[in-house]
């Protein structure tokens, strides 16, 4: 399957609208950096098979939307952003779902890709038990909106990768 | 490849104005922070200043505030330091080097090669 | 601005030997501490950040370790390339501040 282009589109519009986001001085968080542990290795698209990480991208931007639907998340960032920014997400997971159905059938995909959907799953789960821990602080949450910013920009160059392997 | 280039070194005389220039390159500009560290002759390193390429947010550290400006232009991956009137006690070797901003990984990791200023009459 | 204070200043040693510096923050810096190798003439190089995390492609003989307040840079078998000043820096607050330096030196 080729990724479309309107996806790679989709992932920078994404970036920007999270870039957008900002309320508050980066400057004054830093105490606040964590390291979340970002699964690189199941992105890596010469250790893994292009099926693997495509449901890879698919599972973290599914997070993404459920991390960024919650109502502290609601309440942190702009609403008129944050609905954009939902509308992105959503396309981009309709086209991966395209996708992945394309690449292997349905029924395998769940096997096949279970370890790292696993490890983007924990993943976000140390990102939620952070913000918690944090008490969804303003700049829990621009830590955690830089770290989304790293993940997405690293996927949208291994999504370059893929599709020029086709 | 990451890199930062820096700028050519710099004679100026004092009361004369400059501008230095940190070029990066191999990574995404505004992904990054950019901060300016002095090194006078046979000193050690002091922190000047740092800028968010990406909305060109800046903080000074109190020492060098109202004596320089820091700036950035994204759309040519550039950030500067720049002096409206120099003084002799200017002359230092100055190094960018670039931040991950809140992401957790190495700081400061790249640094560019130096910029020479030395301010005589 | 919180005051990062090395000790020593410099020191004189002999290839192989274990060298040791530390470093002392004003308050509390928790882990956010960045260890930097600098030759002459040359830019500085990081080491260790996050006061234990070996950057990529240091030598597994530089090692960090502490918290808090009171960290540590250790070489554990000194090479003839170690011969270097080398400082701490917090990285928990701005303005980030330096140490003032360690020259290590060959006996």
């Known amino acids: 399957c080729d990724l479309p282009q309107t996806h790679s589109l989709g992932n920078r519009r994404a970036l920007i609208l999270l870039a957008q986001m900002g309320r508050i001085s980066h400057f004054s968080c830093l105490k606040d950096r964590y390291d979340f542990g970002f699964p690189q290795e199941v992105f890596d698209g010469n250790q893994f098979q292009k099926a693997q990480a495509i449901s890879a991208f698919h599972e973290m931007i599914q997070q993404t939307f459920n991390l960024f639907s919650t109502k502290d998340s609601s309440a942190a960032w702009d609403e008129t952003l944050l609905d954009k920014f939902y509308i992105e997400l959503f396309q981009q997971l309709n086209d991966l779902e395209a996708c992945v159905t394309q690449e292997v059938g349905v029924e395998e995909i769940a096997l096949m890709n279970e370890d790292s959907i696993l490890a983007v799953r924990k993943y976000f789960q140390r990102i939620t038990l952070y913000l918690m821990g944090k008490k969804y602080s303003p700049c829990a949450w621009e830590v955690v909106r830089a770290e989304i910013m790293r993940s997405f920009s690293f996927s949208t160059n291994l999504q370059k990768g893929l599709r020029r392997k086709d | 490849e990451v890199q930062l280039v820096q700028s050519g070194a710099e004679v100026k005389k004092p009361g004369e104005s400059l501008k230095i220039s940190c070029k990066g390159s191999?990574?995404?500009?505004?992904?990054?922070?950019i901060g300016w560290v002095r090194q006078m002759p046979g000193k050690g390193l002091e922190w000047m200043g740092i800028?968010?390429?990406?909305?060109?947010?800046?903080r000074y550290s109190p020492s060098f505030q109202g004596q320089v400006t820091i700036s950035a232009d994204k759309s040519i991956s550039t950030a500067y330091l720049q002096w409206s009137s120099l003084k002799a006690s200017d002359t230092a070797m100055y190094y960018c080097?670039?931040?991950?901003?809140?992401?957790?990984?190495?700081?400061?990791?790249?640094w560019g090669q130096g910029t020479l200023v030395t301010v005589s009459s | 601005d919180i005051q990062m204070t090395q000790s020593p200043s410099s020191l004189s040693a002999s290839v192989g030997d274990r060298v040791t510096i530390t470093c002392r923050a004003s308050?509390?810096?928790?882990?956010?501490l960045n260890w930097y190798q600098q030759k002459p003439g040359k830019a500085p190089k990081l080491l260790i950040y996050?006061?234990?995390s070996l950057q990529s492609g240091v030598p597994s003989r530089f090692s960090g370790s502490g918290s808090g307040t009171d960290f540590t840079l250790t070489i554990s078998s000194l090479q003839p390339e170690d011969f270097a000043t080398y400082y701490c820096?917090?990285?928990?607050?701005?303005?980030?501040?330096f140490g003032q330096g360690t020259k290590v030196e060959i006996k």
């Open positions: 820096q917090q990285a928990i607050d701005l303005p980030f501040t």
């Open positions: 308050q509390s810096i928790n882990r956010f």
């Open positions: 080097a670039r931040h991950p901003g809140l992401n957790w990984a190495p700081d400061f990791d790249y």
């Open positions: 800028i968010d390429p990406s909305d060109s947010d800046t």
């Open positions: 191999g990574y995404s500009f505004t992904s990054y922070w």
């Open positions: 996050a006061a234990s």
